[in-house]
């Protein structure tokens, strides 16, 4: 993902795939877009860690 590896925070488990425009956005480290509560942009994003 654009933002990369793991971040130590929890998110809601009920996620759905987000549209490609959101996937291609700025990374969180550059002040990028926050995750939509029901959107999962794929494994590996720093703002979307896997299960703890």
């Amino acid at each position: 993902g654009l933002a990369g590896g793991s971040a130590q925070s929890q998110r809601a488990p009920d996620r759905v795939l987000c549209h490609s425009g959101q996937q291609q956005g700025l990374p969180r480290a550059a002040g990028g877009s926050v995750p939509h509560p029901r959107c999962h942009c794929g494994a590996g994003r720093a703002d979307w860690p896997g299960p703890p």
Epitope: G5, P27, S33, A46
Partner: antibody, heavy 112, light 107 residues
Framework: EVQLQQSGPELVKPGASVKMSCKAS????????MMWVKQSHGKSLEWIGD????????SYNQKFKGKATLTVDKSSSTAYIQLNSLTSEDSAVYYC?????WGQGTLVTVSA | DIQMTQTTSSLSASLGDRVTITCRSS??????LNWYQQKPDGPVKLLIY???RLHSGVPSRFSGSGSGTDYSLTISNLEQEDLATYFC?????????FGGGTKVEIK
Amino acid sequence: EVQLQQSGPELVKPGASVKMSCKASGYTFTDYYMMWVKQSHGKSLEWIGDINPNNYDTSYNQKFKGKATLTVDKSSSTAYIQLNSLTSEDSAVYYCASKAYWGQGTLVTVSA
Amino acid sequence: DIQMTQTTSSLSASLGDRVTITCRSSQDISNSLNWYQQKPDGPVKLLIYSTSRLHSGVPSRFSGSGSGTDYSLTISNLEQEDLATYFCQQGHTLPWTFGGGTKVEIK
């Protein structure tokens, strides 16, 4: 046009606290992380932490836990950083940044 | 924390030169690398994110490349307005960390 307008310079005494603001305009404030960065003496940059303005979720650099507190006011599209128990090591320029754009910085000088 | 190293703290080049600035991370950051420009007494601006993606409004003479732990920013045709300090930043693992900066001066 994205703009991040930061509050003016602060001269504070050791041991005191300071609260700085960053007013955002030109984009949907709640859609983007707001991060804060410290720059000491015109040198390198240190990420303090960030906040999700939509749900107030914060992440901090361990180095700044207990030193910095990040908050937002959604109604005014304004982010805040409070620094407490100030020492000379906290003298620096503090930047807010969101949606890839940075504020102009707030100079904090800690001096007796 | 991931350490970001910019071994060249300053460099001097002539107008029109091709300038390359390098940045190394202490571990693989999987292309999660951003570049910023800070002009003297000026604002900080994002130039490139995710190794090679040009931020909106940034001149095409700026480009980025790299992988793993080694990354670079290239200015293909140096202009006077490029006088600035350039910082790399990793966005792979919290806390995000920055390199020490490379100051580009004009000969």
